[in-house]
């Protein structure tokens, strides 16, 4: 706790002080006072620099004195033998004695009192900028007329801050301009314009005279302009050293004029005005600006339109143009939007075909679709080449954006049928010779695949079972083979409307219009063992002549077995219909005359006992296409016969092509269109 006075005595005073002692006293008087410390008695062992025993007086970090020896007063009217006057309110006194004393020393007696200090004169640094007034225990500063004391209570300045300029045009000058500006002042002027306008400051060189910079180049008095995070200045000297036109790019400007205590000049005068904020004419690649202007300012709107093949991508939506507005901050709205090359994206995959992964999917890129050859070909032409168009679609020169369609190649067996090992009435065959061959397990019969979704068969095969189970792709009909082959599931059976349905089919004598179509639930995947047969054309080229050869295949009855395990086939010639009429029916269910023969039937066989038989029904009578020798078409379907091993009757498919096409079209799925 600070005190106004006090006494300090060495240990055991007035008796001799002990050896090896160190004792300190911290003196503190109230703030605003100094300390007067005086000794009335001093008897301490004398040594050089008071190295042995001493009393030390310390003020802050400064040693004010170090005492030893004996002292007596020089003034008979005063007991003071040594004194110290410090202008600070804290002092430390330290007494030290060493390990031995040659004589008996009594130490010291000292007193301190708080004394007033004159802050206005006692210090090197003058505490007040203008007038200093001392009083006991302190001081205060005061100012000349028209100056005011700053919050620091030391500095005086003029009241030149707080002006806010909002007009779009104006003039600002330093205090008293053109008379000398006040010293030791900080003047702040604020210009605040409507958003979207930038403050433009104009000065004339001759309207500026501010105390020049020191030798280090630092302005003693300075004028500074601050616009947001940008600063212009500090400026000082005779004649304005900065640009005479300052575009601040901001609607807010702070002008700060700082002066020191010395060297007043006439000051400065400036004009300002508000310019609509300019926006830079940006280089936006691959686009056109509308309207095109040399300069764009606040509130200007432009439409930026992308060149063909470029688009603006915002989120997931692509557009070809966008609007941009010159904003109050001098920046364009939508500046993040760019015209990028149109991306057509990963091309859609196609059924039974492929597209190579493109190196690029951007505007101008080219891709090529191919079909899974040799089982599929591109039906709708166009060559399969597509380029990424400006509208973001993959486009083909012929088809436009329509995708190519890979459809099965018909009538081309992977391996041609050769009559190798002779079997009575026929040869062993491989499914690759007849990849269109379909096996029906109930009733045991055949059919012909004519495309991905349709199987052609005889009406009498499906009349009793409208949900037949069919298999493709297997030479053998052993269970384990069928389990590994492709099972076809029917969606619907379409029997020709001309086929007469009987209550007792076993007694049938009329096989006219013995044709049916089975629509499949799922498309069949083509390959070396599964591939369709072609349909006949409607031209006269497809009219069969006697002696024309055709191939039949199936798992029907052979001379050895009721049902063949492996596919059998034979090559038969077309014969006149009368040849079939002449053969006696083996197990007639009616008079021979009751059996109906019509132009919808083909008669074939009669050579070397080769014939179709029970269990072969519905299979194709395949004839080489007259216009493309590499292909086979279904000229007939195994229908009926008077006797196995003689002649057989086949449904003449050419007569039903219209019905087949119409039925398929009316019952196709969108996926097939």
């Amino acid at each position: 706790e600070p005190t106004m006075y006090g006494e300090i005595l060495s240990p055991n005073y007035p008796q001799a002080y002990p050896s090896e002692v160190e004792k300190s006293w911290d003196i503190e008087v109230p703030e605003g006072y100094g300390i007067h410390l005086y000794f009335t008695h001093l008897d301490i062992e004398l040594s050089e620099n008071c190295a042995y025993d001493s009393v030390q007086i310390i003020s802050g970090d400064t040693e004010e004195g170090r005492l030893c020896g004996q002292r007596s007063s020089n003034n008979p009217h005063s007991p003071i033998v040594e004194e110290f006057q410090v202008p600070y309110n804290k002092l430390q006194v330290i007494f030290k004695s060493d390990f031995s004393n040659e004589e008996r020393f009594t130490g010291f007696a000292a007193y301190y009192v708080a004394t007033d200090i004159n802050e206005c004169t006692d210090f090197v640094d003058v505490p007040c900028s203008h007038f200093c007034n001392n009083f006991i225990g302190g001081y205060f500063c005061s100012c000349p007329p028209e100056y005011f004391l700053h919050d620091d209570m030391k500095n005086c300045g003029v009241n030149c801050s707080g002006d806010v300029f909002t007009a779009l045009i104006g003039e600002i000058a330093s205090p008293n301009y053109p008379k000398p500006y006040p010293e030791n002042s900080r003047c702040e002027y604020q210009i605040r314009l409507e958003k979207g306008f930038q403050v433009v400051v104009t000065l004339r060189r001759e309207d500026f005279d501010v105390e020049a910079a020191d030798s280090a180049g630092n302005c003693l008095d300075s004028l500074v302009f601050v616009a947001g995070d940008r600063q212009f200045g500090p400026y000082c000297g005779h004649g304005f050293p900065g640009p005479l036109n300052i575009e601040t790019k901001s609607n807010a400007l702070d002008i700060i004029f700082q002066t020191d205590l010395t060297g007043q000049k006439k000051g400065w005068k400036l004009r300002y005005h508000g310019d609509p904020m300019p926006c830079p004419k940006e280089d936006t690649p691959n686009s056109v600006w509308e309207p095109a202007k040399a300069k764009y300012v606040f509130r200007d709107v432009v439409q930026i339109t992308c060149l063909d093949g470029f688009e603006v991508v915002e989120g997931r939506v692509g557009a070809t143009s966008f609007y941009s507005t010159c904003q109050s901050n001098g920046k364009w709205s939508n500046s993040k939007l760019k015209c990028q090359p149109v991306d057509c994206g990963i091309p859609e995959s196609i059924e039974n075909g492929k597209v190579e992964d493109p190196e690029s999917t951007l505007f101008g890129s080219v891709i090529r679709y191919t079909c899974e050859e040799p089982y599929y070909y591109m039906e709708n032409g166009g060559g399969g080449e597509y380029h990424c168009a400006g509208n973001g679609s993959w486009v083909n020169e012929v088809l436009g954006p329509e995708l190519p369609k890979c459809v099965p190649v018909c009538g081309v067996p992977r391996e041609p049928f050769e009559e190798k090992q002779r079997i009575i009435g026929g040869s062993d065959a491989d499914i690759k010779n007849f990849p269109w061959q379909v096996f029906f397990d109930n009733p045991w019969a055949g059919g012909a695949l004519i495309n991905e979704y349709w199987v052609l068969t005889a009406a009498h095969v499906v009349e009793g079972n409208r949900e037949p189970t069919m298999y493709v792709g297997s030479t053998s009909v052993q269970t384990s083979r069928l389990a590994k082959s492709k099972m076809l599931t029917p969606e619907h059976v379409f029997i020709h409307p001309g086929w007469k349905l009987l209550e007792v089919p076993e007694g049938r004598t009329n096989f006219d219009n013995d044709i049916a179509l089975v629509r499949l639930k799922d498309p069949v995947k083509m390959g070396p063992t599964v591939s369709p047969i072609c349909l006949p054309g409607t031209s006269s080229d497809y009219n069969l002549m006697d002696g024309d050869l055709g191939l039949i295949s199936g798992w029907g009855r052979t001379e050895k077995r009721d049902r063949a395990v492996r596919l059998k086939a034979a090559r038969l010639p077309v014969a006149p219909l009368r040849k079939c009429k002449e053969v006696k029916v083996e197990k007639p269910t009616a008079d021979a005359e009751a059996y109906v023969f019509t132009p919808n039937m083909i008669c074939a066989g009669g050579e070397k006992g080769m014939d179709s038989c029970k269990g072969d029904s519905g299979g194709a009578f395949a004839v080489q296409d007259p216009n493309d020798k590499t292909k086979f078409y279904a000229a007939g379907l195994v229908s009926w016969g008077p006797q196995c091993g003689t002649y057989g009757l086949y449904t003449r498919v050419k007569n039903y092509v219209d019905w087949i096409m119409k039925t398929m079209q009316e019952n196709s799925t969108p996926r097939e269109d």
Epitope: Q478, K484, R566
Partner: antibody, heavy 119, light 107 residues
């Protein structure tokens, strides 16, 4: 009428081999797929393997792999099943069975051959 | 290999009862499943093939259903001749597997 006639019962010592034959009559072996099935006394049926004429390879159940050999002599229309390293648990009736067509698994069963493995 | 699990292993029933035997495959076998009946000392007799097709000559009281992994054999009205052991069999590939069998005995 197709028939399968198997060889007679056999008694074998552990570690020995047994060869069971199955003669086809009324058809040719080349037209058939022959399977072998066994049944231990009071136990269930166990499929042992078959010859796949399409692939020309023999397929064995994992359990018998390395111990069983199935062969065919098409000149005599006879199928054979040989089981080696016999153990007492191989005591069973061994059947030859023809594979059916169009989804029918087994068509025709032989009369069975009892093989007894006993020391 | 595919595992076939039949349940129950034994079933006691009376003449005229409706009997159901189930068979579960360890993986999908589509419809490639058969049911056999076996009497002591005889070779098995095929009842059902392709999960639901009735073999010719088999009485219509026998029926099969299911596909994938779950299959059922049903005897609508048990007859004295039906007391036997029944086996399911998978044959969707060249590794054919039998179930362990279900013995149907007189209650």
């Amino acid at each position: 009428q197709v028939q399968l006639v198997q060889s007679g019962a056999e008694v074998k010592k552990p570690g020995a081999s047994v060869k069971v034959s199955c003669k086809v009559s009324g058809d040719t072996l080349t037209e058939l797929s022959m399977h072998w099935v066994r049944q231990a006394p009071g136990k269930g049926l166990e499929w042992m393997g078959t010859f796949d004429p399409e692939e020309g390879e023999t397929i064995y159940a994992q359990k018998f792999q390395g111990r069983v050999t199935m062969t065919e002599d098409t000149s005599t229309d006879t199928a054979y099943m040989e089981l080696s390293s016999l153990r007492s648990e191989d005591t069973a009736v061994y059947y030859c069975v023809t594979e059916g067509l169009a989804g029918v698994p087994f068509d025709l069963w032989g009369q069975g051959t009892l093989v007894t493995v006993s020391s | 290999d595919i595992q076939m699990t039949q349940s129950p292993s034994t079933l006691s029933a009376s003449v005229g009862d409706r009997v159901t035997i189930t068979c579960r495959a360890s993986q999908s076998i589509s419809s490639w499943l058969a049911w056999y009946q076996q009497k002591p000392g005889k070779a098995p007799k095929l009842l059902i093939y392709k999960a639901s097709s009735l073999e010719s000559g088999v009485p219509s009281r026998f029926s099969g259903s299911g596909s994938g992994t779950e299959f059922t054999l049903t005897i609508s009205s048990l007859q004295p001749d039906d007391f036997a052991t029944y086996y399911c069999q998978s044959y969707n590939s060249y590794v054919w597997t039998f179930g362990q069998g279900t013995k149907v005995e007189i209650k």
